[in-house]
Protein backbone atom coordinates (compact mmCIF):
# COMPACT_ATOMS: atom_id res chain seq x y z
CA UNK A 1 0.00 0.00 0.00
CA UNK A 2 1.16 3.49 -0.82
CA UNK A 3 0.94 5.98 2.02
CA UNK A 4 -1.41 8.92 1.57
CA UNK A 5 -0.32 12.11 3.29
CA UNK A 6 -2.88 14.32 4.98
CA UNK A 7 -1.80 17.64 6.37
CA UNK A 8 -3.87 18.85 9.29
CA UNK A 9 -3.54 22.11 11.16
CA UNK A 10 -2.89 22.30 14.90
CA UNK A 11 -6.00 23.11 16.90
CA UNK A 12 -8.26 22.45 13.93
CA UNK A 13 -10.28 19.44 12.82
CA UNK A 14 -9.09 17.04 10.16
CA UNK A 15 -11.13 14.55 8.20
CA UNK A 16 -9.54 11.54 6.59
CA UNK A 17 -11.48 9.50 4.05
CA UNK A 18 -10.60 5.99 3.05
CA UNK A 19 -12.33 4.69 -0.09
CA UNK A 20 -12.93 0.99 -0.54
CA UNK A 21 -14.81 -1.58 -2.63
CA UNK A 22 -18.20 -1.75 -0.94
CA UNK A 23 -18.96 -5.21 -2.34
CA UNK A 24 -15.64 -6.75 -1.38
CA UNK A 25 -15.93 -5.44 2.16
CA UNK A 26 -19.68 -6.01 2.53
CA UNK A 27 -20.64 -6.85 6.11
CA UNK A 28 -17.24 -5.94 7.53
CA UNK A 29 -16.66 -3.52 10.36
CA UNK A 30 -13.89 -0.96 9.96
CA UNK A 31 -11.26 0.50 12.22
CA UNK A 32 -8.69 3.26 12.49
CA UNK A 33 -5.37 2.39 14.10
CA UNK A 34 -2.07 4.04 14.82
CA UNK A 35 1.12 2.37 13.63
CA UNK A 36 3.55 1.95 16.49
CA UNK A 37 6.99 2.04 14.96
CA UNK A 38 7.97 0.99 11.47
CA UNK A 39 7.23 -2.70 11.99
CA UNK A 40 5.29 -2.53 15.22
CA UNK A 41 1.62 -3.33 15.74
CA UNK A 42 -1.18 -1.03 14.70
CA UNK A 43 -2.89 0.11 17.89
CA UNK A 44 -6.59 0.58 17.42
CA UNK A 45 -7.92 4.05 18.08
CA UNK A 46 -11.57 3.62 17.19
CA UNK A 47 -13.78 1.17 15.29
CA UNK A 48 -17.22 1.33 13.71
CA UNK A 49 -20.40 0.19 15.43
CA UNK A 50 -20.52 -3.41 16.61
CA UNK A 51 -23.61 -3.88 14.43
CA UNK A 52 -22.48 -3.47 10.83
CA UNK A 53 -25.89 -2.12 9.77
CA UNK A 54 -25.33 0.77 12.17
CA UNK A 55 -21.87 1.61 10.81
CA UNK A 56 -23.18 4.98 9.61
CA UNK A 57 -23.48 6.09 13.24
CA UNK A 58 -20.51 8.16 14.31
CA UNK A 59 -18.48 6.59 17.09
CA UNK A 60 -16.01 8.56 19.17
CA UNK A 61 -12.95 7.69 21.19
CA UNK A 62 -11.73 10.87 22.81
CA UNK A 63 -11.38 13.35 19.99
CA UNK A 64 -11.34 10.79 17.17
CA UNK A 65 -14.54 9.80 15.40
CA UNK A 66 -15.30 7.18 12.78
CA UNK A 67 -18.26 6.71 10.45
CA UNK A 68 -18.74 4.35 7.52
CA UNK A 69 -20.74 4.86 4.34
CA UNK A 70 -21.08 1.17 3.56
CA UNK A 71 -23.04 1.72 0.34
CA UNK A 72 -20.76 4.39 -1.07
CA UNK A 73 -17.64 2.66 0.17
CA UNK A 74 -16.06 5.48 2.15
CA UNK A 75 -14.75 5.32 5.67
CA UNK A 76 -14.36 8.71 7.31
CA UNK A 77 -12.22 9.56 10.29
CA UNK A 78 -12.54 12.90 12.06
CA UNK A 79 -9.68 14.12 14.21
CA UNK A 80 -10.75 17.01 16.40
CA UNK A 81 -8.42 19.60 17.93
CA UNK A 82 -5.35 18.23 16.18
CA UNK A 83 -2.14 18.43 18.18
CA UNK A 84 1.54 17.90 17.26
CA UNK A 85 1.57 14.56 19.05
CA UNK A 86 -1.17 13.30 16.73
CA UNK A 87 1.27 13.27 13.83
CA UNK A 88 2.24 9.84 12.63
CA UNK A 89 1.33 6.82 10.56
CA UNK A 90 -2.17 5.37 10.72
CA UNK A 91 -4.22 2.76 8.90
CA UNK A 92 -7.80 2.40 7.81
CA UNK A 93 -8.70 -1.23 8.21
CA UNK A 94 -11.45 -3.67 7.26
CA UNK A 95 -12.09 -6.34 9.87
CA UNK A 96 -12.98 -9.98 9.35
CA UNK A 97 -12.70 -12.40 12.24
CA UNK A 98 -9.45 -11.71 14.00
CA UNK A 99 -7.86 -10.46 10.79
CA UNK A 100 -7.65 -6.96 9.39
CA UNK A 101 -7.10 -5.84 5.81
CA UNK A 102 -5.44 -2.50 5.26
CA UNK A 103 -7.63 -0.19 3.21
CA UNK A 104 -5.25 2.76 3.26
CA UNK A 105 -2.07 3.82 5.00
CA UNK A 106 -2.28 7.42 6.11
CA UNK A 107 0.50 9.72 7.24
CA UNK A 108 -0.93 12.55 9.32
CA UNK A 109 1.22 15.68 9.42
CA UNK A 110 0.36 18.39 11.92
CA UNK A 111 1.12 21.89 10.72
CA UNK A 112 1.27 25.20 12.52
CA UNK A 113 -1.80 27.39 12.10
CA UNK A 114 -0.64 30.67 10.59
CA UNK A 115 -3.76 32.55 11.59
CA UNK A 116 -4.68 31.20 15.00
CA UNK A 117 -2.53 33.19 17.39
CA UNK A 118 -4.60 32.43 20.46
CA UNK A 119 -4.86 36.18 21.06
CA UNK A 120 -1.32 36.12 22.38
CA UNK A 121 0.29 37.19 19.16
CA UNK A 122 2.79 34.36 19.33
CA UNK A 123 2.70 30.80 18.15
CA UNK A 124 3.40 28.05 20.62
CA UNK A 125 6.46 26.14 19.51
CA UNK A 126 6.72 22.67 21.05
CA UNK A 127 10.02 21.73 22.58
CA UNK A 128 12.34 19.35 20.78
CA UNK A 129 11.72 16.75 23.49
CA UNK A 130 8.03 16.54 22.69
CA UNK A 131 8.30 13.88 20.05
CA UNK A 132 5.51 12.26 18.09
CA UNK A 133 6.29 8.93 19.71
CA UNK A 134 5.12 10.29 23.06
CA UNK A 135 1.61 10.71 21.73
CA UNK A 136 -1.25 8.69 23.10
CA UNK A 137 -3.51 7.04 20.60
CA UNK A 138 -6.55 8.31 22.49
CA UNK A 139 -5.70 11.90 21.66
CA UNK A 140 -7.94 13.53 19.15
CA UNK A 141 -7.06 14.12 15.57
CA UNK A 142 -9.17 16.72 13.82
CA UNK A 143 -9.42 17.28 10.13
CA UNK A 144 -11.57 17.11 7.01
CA UNK A 145 -12.76 13.73 5.87
CA UNK A 146 -10.45 11.78 3.65
CA UNK A 147 -11.35 8.81 1.60
CA UNK A 148 -10.25 5.67 3.28
CA UNK A 149 -11.28 3.02 5.68
CA UNK A 150 -9.80 1.51 8.67
CA UNK A 151 -10.37 -2.16 9.26
CA UNK A 152 -9.39 -3.41 12.67
CA UNK A 153 -9.94 -6.75 14.30
CA UNK A 154 -13.10 -6.70 16.39
CA UNK A 155 -12.64 -5.93 20.03
CA UNK A 156 -13.12 -8.84 22.30
Amino acid sequence: HNTTVFQGVAGQSLQVSCPYDSMKHWGRRKAWCRQLGEKGPCQRVVSTHNLWLLSFLRRWNGSTAITDDTLGGTLTITLRNLQPHDAGLYQCQSLHGSEADTLRKVLVEVLADPLDHRDAGDLWFPGESESFEDAHVEHSISRSLLEGEIPFPPTS
Epitope: V5, Q12, Q15, A112, P114, L123, F125, L145, L146
Partner: antibody, heavy 122, light 112 residues
Protein backbone atom coordinates in the same frame (compact mmCIF):
# COMPACT_ATOMS: atom_id res chain seq x y z
CA UNK B 1 -8.98 21.28 -13.19
CA UNK B 2 -9.17 23.64 -10.22
CA UNK B 3 -10.63 27.03 -11.09
CA UNK B 4 -11.54 30.21 -9.23
CA UNK B 5 -13.54 32.95 -10.91
CA UNK B 6 -13.89 36.35 -9.25
CA UNK B 7 -16.48 39.02 -10.01
CA UNK B 8 -17.86 42.23 -8.56
CA UNK B 9 -14.92 44.60 -8.89
CA UNK B 10 -15.16 48.12 -10.22
CA UNK B 11 -14.93 51.77 -9.24
CA UNK B 12 -16.25 52.97 -5.90
CA UNK B 13 -15.92 56.19 -3.92
CA UNK B 14 -14.12 56.36 -0.57
CA UNK B 15 -16.51 55.36 2.20
CA UNK B 16 -18.55 53.28 -0.20
CA UNK B 17 -19.26 49.55 -0.27
CA UNK B 18 -18.67 46.74 -2.71
CA UNK B 19 -19.21 42.97 -2.70
CA UNK B 20 -16.83 40.58 -4.42
CA UNK B 21 -17.78 37.02 -5.28
CA UNK B 22 -15.80 33.96 -6.26
CA UNK B 23 -17.06 30.71 -7.70
CA UNK B 24 -14.83 27.66 -7.45
CA UNK B 25 -14.77 24.34 -9.28
CA UNK B 26 -12.59 21.28 -9.75
CA UNK B 27 -12.19 20.31 -6.09
CA UNK B 28 -14.26 19.60 -2.99
CA UNK B 29 -15.15 23.16 -2.08
CA UNK B 30 -16.74 22.28 1.28
CA UNK B 31 -13.41 20.88 2.52
CA UNK B 32 -11.42 23.99 1.65
CA UNK B 33 -10.44 27.12 3.54
CA UNK B 34 -11.12 30.03 1.22
CA UNK B 35 -9.07 33.23 1.12
CA UNK B 36 -8.87 36.64 -0.49
CA UNK B 37 -5.45 38.11 -1.28
CA UNK B 38 -5.03 41.54 -2.87
CA UNK B 39 -2.26 43.13 -4.86
CA UNK B 40 -1.39 46.78 -5.40
CA UNK B 41 1.73 48.54 -6.70
CA UNK B 42 2.11 50.27 -3.34
CA UNK B 43 1.67 47.32 -0.98
CA UNK B 44 2.41 44.32 -3.19
CA UNK B 45 0.69 41.06 -2.30
CA UNK B 46 -1.34 41.26 0.90
CA UNK B 47 -3.50 38.59 2.50
CA UNK B 48 -6.95 39.98 3.33
CA UNK B 49 -9.31 37.38 4.79
CA UNK B 50 -10.03 33.68 5.25
CA UNK B 51 -13.05 31.54 6.00
CA UNK B 52 -12.54 27.94 7.08
CA UNK B 53 -14.61 24.86 6.36
CA UNK B 54 -17.67 23.54 8.16
CA UNK B 55 -15.75 21.09 10.30
CA UNK B 56 -13.81 24.09 11.59
CA UNK B 57 -17.00 26.05 12.24
CA UNK B 58 -16.55 28.40 9.27
CA UNK B 59 -14.14 30.41 11.42
CA UNK B 60 -13.14 33.73 9.88
CA UNK B 61 -9.86 35.64 10.01
CA UNK B 62 -8.96 39.12 8.78
CA UNK B 63 -5.90 41.25 8.21
CA UNK B 64 -5.66 44.09 10.74
CA UNK B 65 -6.03 46.65 7.96
CA UNK B 66 -9.54 45.42 7.05
CA UNK B 67 -10.86 44.16 10.39
CA UNK B 68 -14.28 45.61 11.16
CA UNK B 69 -14.79 46.78 7.58
CA UNK B 70 -14.67 43.58 5.52
CA UNK B 71 -16.75 40.43 5.98
CA UNK B 72 -16.01 37.09 4.34
CA UNK B 73 -18.76 34.51 3.87
CA UNK B 74 -19.31 31.29 1.94
CA UNK B 75 -22.09 29.20 0.44
CA UNK B 76 -20.97 25.59 0.13
CA UNK B 77 -24.07 24.66 -1.86
CA UNK B 78 -22.96 27.08 -4.58
CA UNK B 79 -19.21 26.56 -4.15
CA UNK B 80 -18.87 30.30 -3.67
CA UNK B 81 -17.18 32.73 -1.33
CA UNK B 82 -17.90 36.45 -0.97
CA UNK B 83 -16.13 39.46 0.43
CA UNK B 84 -18.34 42.33 1.58
CA UNK B 85 -16.23 45.49 1.74
CA UNK B 86 -17.56 48.51 3.61
CA UNK B 87 -16.06 51.91 4.49
CA UNK B 88 -13.66 51.55 1.59
CA UNK B 89 -10.47 53.58 1.56
CA UNK B 90 -8.17 54.58 -1.29
CA UNK B 91 -5.57 52.15 0.08
CA UNK B 92 -7.99 49.26 -0.54
CA UNK B 93 -7.45 49.75 -4.27
CA UNK B 94 -5.96 46.72 -5.98
CA UNK B 95 -6.56 43.41 -7.70
CA UNK B 96 -8.41 41.01 -5.42
CA UNK B 97 -7.63 37.33 -5.90
CA UNK B 98 -9.67 34.39 -4.69
CA UNK B 99 -7.52 31.49 -3.52
CA UNK B 100 -7.43 28.67 -0.98
CA UNK B 101 -4.84 28.21 1.75
CA UNK B 102 -6.00 24.68 2.60
CA UNK B 103 -7.93 22.24 0.44
CA UNK B 104 -8.66 19.70 3.17
CA UNK B 105 -5.40 17.84 2.56
CA UNK B 106 -2.60 20.31 1.88
CA UNK B 107 -1.62 23.74 3.13
CA UNK B 108 -0.47 26.18 0.42
CA UNK B 109 -1.92 28.73 -2.01
CA UNK B 110 -1.82 26.31 -4.91
CA UNK B 111 -4.45 27.89 -7.13
CA UNK B 112 -5.50 31.48 -7.76
CA UNK B 113 -8.24 33.14 -9.76
CA UNK B 114 -7.45 35.76 -12.38
CA UNK B 115 -8.46 38.53 -9.99
CA UNK B 116 -10.95 41.38 -10.04
CA UNK B 117 -9.86 45.01 -9.93
CA UNK B 118 -11.22 47.25 -7.18
CA UNK B 119 -10.58 50.99 -7.55
CA UNK B 120 -11.42 53.28 -4.65
CA UNK B 121 -11.27 56.85 -5.86
CA UNK B 122 -13.20 60.09 -5.66
CA UNK C 1 4.15 40.09 11.46
CA UNK C 2 7.08 38.32 9.87
CA UNK C 3 8.66 40.48 7.20
CA UNK C 4 10.25 39.05 4.08
CA UNK C 5 13.00 40.93 2.27
CA UNK C 6 13.78 39.92 -1.29
CA UNK C 7 16.93 40.79 -3.19
CA UNK C 8 17.72 41.99 -5.69
CA UNK C 9 14.53 43.94 -6.51
CA UNK C 10 15.26 43.42 -10.20
CA UNK C 11 17.73 41.40 -12.20
CA UNK C 12 18.65 41.48 -15.89
CA UNK C 13 19.67 38.09 -17.24
CA UNK C 14 20.52 36.34 -20.48
CA UNK C 15 18.95 33.07 -21.60
CA UNK C 16 20.93 30.09 -20.32
CA UNK C 17 22.26 31.89 -17.24
CA UNK C 18 21.97 30.51 -13.72
CA UNK C 19 20.00 32.86 -11.47
CA UNK C 20 19.85 33.03 -7.69
CA UNK C 21 17.08 34.96 -5.92
CA UNK C 22 17.24 35.65 -2.20
CA UNK C 23 14.52 35.89 0.46
CA UNK C 24 15.34 36.77 4.07
CA UNK C 25 12.83 36.50 6.88
CA UNK C 26 12.74 38.78 9.95
CA UNK C 27 12.05 35.67 12.08
CA UNK C 28 12.61 31.98 11.56
CA UNK C 29 9.87 30.24 9.60
CA UNK C 30 11.10 26.80 10.67
CA UNK C 31 8.64 24.88 12.85
CA UNK C 32 10.49 22.36 15.00
CA UNK C 33 7.40 20.27 15.64
CA UNK C 34 7.32 18.96 12.10
CA UNK C 35 10.74 20.05 10.88
CA UNK C 36 9.35 22.17 8.05
CA UNK C 37 10.14 25.62 6.73
CA UNK C 38 6.89 27.44 6.03
CA UNK C 39 8.09 29.26 2.95
CA UNK C 40 6.83 29.22 -0.64
CA UNK C 41 7.90 30.77 -3.95
CA UNK C 42 5.54 32.13 -6.61
CA UNK C 43 6.03 33.24 -10.19
CA UNK C 44 3.87 36.01 -11.61
CA UNK C 45 3.93 36.89 -15.28
CA UNK C 46 2.50 40.22 -16.53
CA UNK C 47 -1.30 40.23 -16.50
CA UNK C 48 -1.48 36.86 -14.76
CA UNK C 49 -2.12 35.67 -11.21
CA UNK C 50 0.68 34.22 -9.07
CA UNK C 51 1.64 30.61 -9.74
CA UNK C 52 2.99 28.38 -6.98
CA UNK C 53 6.44 26.98 -7.78
CA UNK C 54 7.82 25.76 -4.46
CA UNK C 55 6.29 25.02 -1.07
CA UNK C 56 7.97 24.03 2.21
CA UNK C 57 11.09 25.90 1.00
CA UNK C 58 12.18 23.11 -1.34
CA UNK C 59 9.20 21.03 -2.54
CA UNK C 60 8.64 21.63 -6.24
CA UNK C 61 4.99 21.68 -7.31
CA UNK C 62 3.81 19.17 -9.87
CA UNK C 63 4.46 20.39 -13.39
CA UNK C 64 7.14 22.90 -12.40
CA UNK C 65 10.33 22.43 -14.45
CA UNK C 66 13.25 20.97 -12.52
CA UNK C 67 15.42 23.97 -13.36
CA UNK C 68 13.62 25.67 -10.44
CA UNK C 69 15.10 24.74 -7.07
CA UNK C 70 14.26 26.07 -3.62
CA UNK C 71 16.67 25.86 -0.71
CA UNK C 72 17.43 27.35 2.68
CA UNK C 73 16.19 27.09 6.25
CA UNK C 74 15.26 29.30 9.15
CA UNK C 75 15.56 32.87 7.89
CA UNK C 76 17.58 32.62 4.65
CA UNK C 77 16.09 31.16 1.49
CA UNK C 78 17.07 30.93 -2.15
CA UNK C 79 15.28 30.24 -5.40
CA UNK C 80 17.70 29.04 -8.07
CA UNK C 81 16.82 28.93 -11.75
CA UNK C 82 19.31 26.86 -13.69
CA UNK C 83 19.59 27.89 -17.32
CA UNK C 84 16.95 30.62 -17.44
CA UNK C 85 14.50 30.44 -20.33
CA UNK C 86 12.65 33.33 -21.99
CA UNK C 87 9.39 32.11 -20.43
CA UNK C 88 10.90 32.50 -16.95
CA UNK C 89 10.90 36.29 -17.20
CA UNK C 90 8.49 37.30 -14.45
CA UNK C 91 8.28 38.62 -10.90
CA UNK C 92 9.14 36.07 -8.20
CA UNK C 93 7.66 36.35 -4.71
CA UNK C 94 8.48 34.50 -1.53
CA UNK C 95 5.71 33.91 1.00
CA UNK C 96 5.71 32.70 4.59
CA UNK C 97 2.76 30.90 6.15
CA UNK C 98 3.99 30.12 9.65
CA UNK C 99 2.78 33.19 11.51
CA UNK C 100 0.14 35.16 9.66
CA UNK C 101 0.47 35.22 5.87
CA UNK C 102 2.99 37.63 4.40
CA UNK C 103 4.75 38.08 1.07
CA UNK C 104 8.03 39.57 -0.06
CA UNK C 105 8.06 42.60 -2.36
CA UNK C 106 9.26 40.46 -5.26
CA UNK C 107 12.24 40.20 -7.61
CA UNK C 108 11.66 41.16 -11.23
CA UNK C 109 13.55 39.01 -13.71
CA UNK C 110 14.19 40.89 -16.95
CA UNK C 111 15.97 40.15 -20.18
CA UNK C 112 19.41 41.70 -20.55
Amino acid sequence: EVKFEESGGGLVQPGGSMKLSCTASGFTFSDAWMDWVRQSPEKGLEWVAEIRNKINNHATYYAESVKGRFTISRDDSKSSVSLQMNSLRTEDTGIYYCTSLYDGSYLRFAYWGQGTLVTVSA
Amino acid sequence: NIMLTQSPSSLAVSAGEKVTLSCKSSQSVFYSSNQKNYLAWYQQKPGQSPKLLISWASTRESGVPDRFTGSGSGTDFTLTINSVQAEDLAVYYCHQYLSSLTFGAGTKLELK
